[in-house]
C-alpha cells in the first residue's frame, strides 16, 4: 500500500530573467527513493538517480541546475517557462509518487508589485 505523500512548493511565481527553486519532499513512507524525475509538460528536464547522481536534459543544460537536495533550480526564466512542473519519485517497493508545482513567470514590473501566488 502506498502511504507516502509529496509536499511541494505549490503555486509559485518568479520574475522573468530570474531563477527559482522547485522543491518536493516525500514523507510518511519508508520506501526507498531510487530516482526522481523532473518534468515540465511533456519534457523531461532532469533525473536524479539515488546511486548515480544527476543528469540534466541536453536541451535544458544551460538553464537548469541540480539541487538543492532533490530539488531543481531553473535559471534565466522566460514567460514561456510558465506552466506545470512535476517531480516524479520512483520508490521501492511503493512505486511512483508525483508532485505538482505551478510556476508563473511574471514580467519584472508585475513581480515588483507582489507575486500572485505565495509559497505555502
Amino acid at each position: 500500500m502506498m502511504t507516502g505523500t509529496i509536499e511541494t512548493t505549490g503555486n509559485i511565481s518568479a520574475e522573468k530573467g530570474g531563477s527559482i527553486i522547485l522543491q518536493c519532499h516525500l514523507s510518511s513512507t519508508t520506501a526507498q527513493v531510487t530516482q526522481v524525475n523532473w518534468e515540465q509538460q511533456d519534457q523531461l528536464l532532469a533525473i536524479c538517480n539515488a546511486d548515480l547522481g544527476w543528469h540534466i536534459s541536453p536541451s535544458f543544460k544551460d538553464r537548469v541546475a541540480p539541487g538543492p537536495g532533490l530539488g531543481l533550480t531553473l535559471q534565466s526564466l522566460t514567460v514561456n517557462d510558465t506552466g506545470e512542473y512535476f517531480c516524479i519519485y520512483h520508490t521501492y517497493p511503493d512505486g511512483t509518487y508525483t508532485g505538482r508545482i505551478f510556476l508563473e513567470v511574471l514580467e519584472s514590473s508585475v513581480a515588483e508589485h507582489g507575486a500572485r501566488f505565495q509559497i505555502p
Epitope: 511533456d42 547522481g53 541536453p58 536541451s59
Partner: antibody, heavy 119, light 107 residues
Framework: EVKLVESGGALVQPGGSLKLSCAAS????????MYWVRQTPEKRLEWVAS????????YYPDTLKGRFTISRDNAKNTLYLQMSRLKSEDTDMYYC????????????WGQGTSVTVSS | DIVMTQSHKFMSTSVGDRVTITCKAS??????VAWYQQKPGQSPKLLIY???ARHTGVPDRFTGSGSGTDFTLTISNVQSEDLADYFC?????????FGVGTKLELK
Amino acid sequence: EVKLVESGGALVQPGGSLKLSCAASGFTFSDYYMYWVRQTPEKRLEWVASITKGGGSTYYPDTLKGRFTISRDNAKNTLYLQMSRLKSEDTDMYYCARQSSYDFVMDYWGQGTSVTVSS
Amino acid sequence: DIVMTQSHKFMSTSVGDRVTITCKASQDVDTAVAWYQQKPGQSPKLLIYWASARHTGVPDRFTGSGSGTDFTLTISNVQSEDLADYFCQQYSNYPLTFGVGTKLELK
C-alpha cells in the same frame, strides 16, 4: 517485449522527399521520448532528431534542421520522419529508438530501414 | 560539437581474454556516456548508460567506467558472442554524438 519496426525506406532521387514510419509496441508509447538515428554504409552513427512524449518539442542537429521533420501520433503508436530535399549523403540506414526511463539514452532500437538517394 | 574519439578502430582478442575499449570526449561530459554493441546485420544494443550502469540483461562481464573526458568499456572473459562493433555516445549536450566505433575481432 519492446518492439520498434521501421518502414518507408526506398530508393529516391536527389531533391526528392520520403516519409519514414516507426511502429511501436510492447510499451506505453506516449510515455517515452523517441529518436531517429542513422548509420552510414561505413557504420558511422549520427543522431537525426528527437521528440518529446507529447510531440510538443523537437530537436535536430543544425546540419539537418529545415530538411527533416520528426513527428509522432500517440493514438497510432507511430513515430515519423519526413525527409525533404534529399542528398546523396542522406543514403543511410535509419533507426528509430526509444529513450530510457532511467536516463537520456536510447535503450531500444528498431531494425532499421534503408534509404538510398541516387539518380 | 563534442567529438567522441575511439582511437582503436580494431581490437584483437581471444576467447577468455580481458579487453578494454577506450573513448575520449573533446570536452567534459560528466558521466553522460553510453556504450552500444552492434553485431553484423543487427541494430545497436544498449550495454552501458550513465558511464557505468549496466542496462537490463547485460552480462556482468561488461563494465563501464570514467567521467569527464575519458571513458572505458571493459569486457572480461571475452566470449565469441562478444565479437562485434562497440560505439560510445555522449548525451550531455546537443547535438548527441557517437564515436566511430571499435571492432572487436579474434586474433
